[in-house]
Amino acid sequence: GIAFPQNPGCRNTEDKNFPQHVKVNLNILNRNTNSRRPSDYYNRSTSPWNLHRNEDPERYPSVIWEAKCRHLGCVNNEGNINYHMNSVPIQQEILVLRRESQHCPHSFRLEKMLVAVGCTCVTPIVRHVA
Amino acid sequence: GIAFPQNPGCRNTEDKNFPQHVKVNLNILNRNTNSRRPSDYYNRSTSPWNLHRNEDPERYPSVIWEAKCRHLGCVNNEGNINYHMNSVPIQQEILVLRRESQHCPHSFRLEKMLVAVGCTCVTPIVRHVA
């Protein structure tokens, strides 16, 4: 769970399940970041990627976009694939809310997801053989 | 808020505040993703980045790592900076839990954060590879 210091003046802090369950206000702070248009780096990158829609109605957010690198190599100045380099996904662990019961929409559980956000071009690891 | 279909058999679904507040179980599902070894792409990328620690005890997760691109240009084969292209941050919107009251650790609010996860190398020309 989350180990926050507990204040004696708070109701239910002695509850044996605390901090197993917490109350979460779903009126999102900083909601306006939603209005930004998605970046077009996916197309201009030397390691371009496609975005795939991952949808799950039992999860919040229900739609998550996942990146899949278009090429194994990276795009060079001439627009050809250079296989001496690799396009690799940059992954991030995110928190989502998973509905605990299909029937009761007000009870959730935190879930970790590993999502690919975009791709970057890396030099391959050269293995030196003795 | 989150618009999930409401089941008539669920307690409190008629509450005028629903679905303003929900109960969240903090025993995280898929916790084991935490054990994965951090990638070294940040160092091997043609658009390398540094990771900066963003810490906030009133937030869960309290520590978030943010990427800052090391260079304006991208690193070429010789290890020099190529200013014909740019290193740019790949940003993602994530959900975090923000403590609503400093004193009561069991009441939270969802908050959106825009974080830079890593960097990619972009060109001014979109190359379409057959």
Epitope: - | L72, G73, Y83, M85, P89, T123
Partner: antibody, heavy 118, light 110 residues
Framework: EVQLLESGGGLVQPGGSLRLSCAAS????????MSWVRQAPGKGLEWVSA????????YYADSVKGRFTISRDNSKNTLYLQMNSLRAEDTAVYYC???????????WGQGTLVTVSS | NFMLTQPHSVSESPGKTVTISCTRS????????VQWYQQRPGSSPTIVIF?????PSGVPDRFSGSIDSSSNSASLTISGLKTEDEADYYC?????????FGGGTKLTVL
């Protein structure tokens, strides 16, 4: 279609301040570095300042360093130029431009005239 | 800072070809892209060549750009000149800290 619309120009006394805005549309604003370029009456183009797509990096011409501040609000698709301690030689049409990459100004606005005079 | 030097003016007849040069005073021109902008009287600049030799969509193929590393200079060539090509043309390049424009060349189509 890329559109850049500058506003905020006008007449100001030497030593005064002005804030220019550039409203952008038709492209992914946060993906692009943005620049301000000016043109004094009857003269050539002079680069003033630039800012990275995320807003984390800013750059200035020596002639305006310490007096002008570039910023952006990606949630509003707007670029700003805060101009302080204005001088007569700052009189110019100020253009905002979208950079394809750093130093490559691909699209320009129509400009806004700033006149510094007593 | 480096400087970009252009001829003050050039003139040529319709249908002919004209070349405008742009010389970089210091730092290798090959390390940084060169752009060319057209500015008609009373209008904003528009890009006609970017990344040394790339033409944005909508710019006719009569416009071409090139660089010559040996002379550290760039050139804009306009073939099949038309009266609407009459304008000021600015070259532009950059380094990691600044962006520089040439002084501009006034093209007159006779």
């Amino acid at each position: 279609e890329v559109q850049l619309l500058e506003s905020g120009g006008g007449l100001v006394q030497p030593g005064g301040s002005l804030r220019l805005s550039c409203a952008a549309s038709g492209f992914t604003f946060s993906s692009y570095a943005m620049s301000w370029v000016r043109q004094a009456p009857g003269k050539g183009l002079e680069w003033v300042s630039a800012i990275s797509g995320s807003g984390g990096s800013t750059y200035y011409a020596d002639s305006v360093k310490g007096r002008f501040t570039i910023s952006r609000d990606n949630s509003k698709n707007t670029l700003y130029l805060q101009m302080n301690s204005l001088r007569a030689e700052d009189t110019a049409v100020y253009y905002c431009a979208r950079d394809l990459i750093w130093g490559v100004a691909g699209s320009w606005g129509q400009g806004t005239l700033v006149t510094v005079s007593s | 800072n480096f400087m970009l030097t252009q001829p003050h003016s050039v003139s040529e007849s319709p249908g002919k070809t004209v070349t405008i040069s742009c010389t970089r005073s210091s730092g290798s021109l090959a390390n940084y892209y060169v752009q060319w902008y057209q500015q008609r009287p009373g209008s904003s600049p528009t890009i006609v060549i970017f990344a040394n030799n790339q033409r944005p969509s909508g710019v006719p193929d009569r416009f071409s750009g090139s660089i010559d590393s040996s002379s550290n200079s760039a050139s804009l060539t306009i073939s099949g000149l038309k009266t609407e090509d009459e304008a000021d043309y600015y070259c532009q390049s950059y380094d990691p800290h600044s962006v520089v424009f040439g002084g501009g060349t006034k093209l007159t189509v006779l």
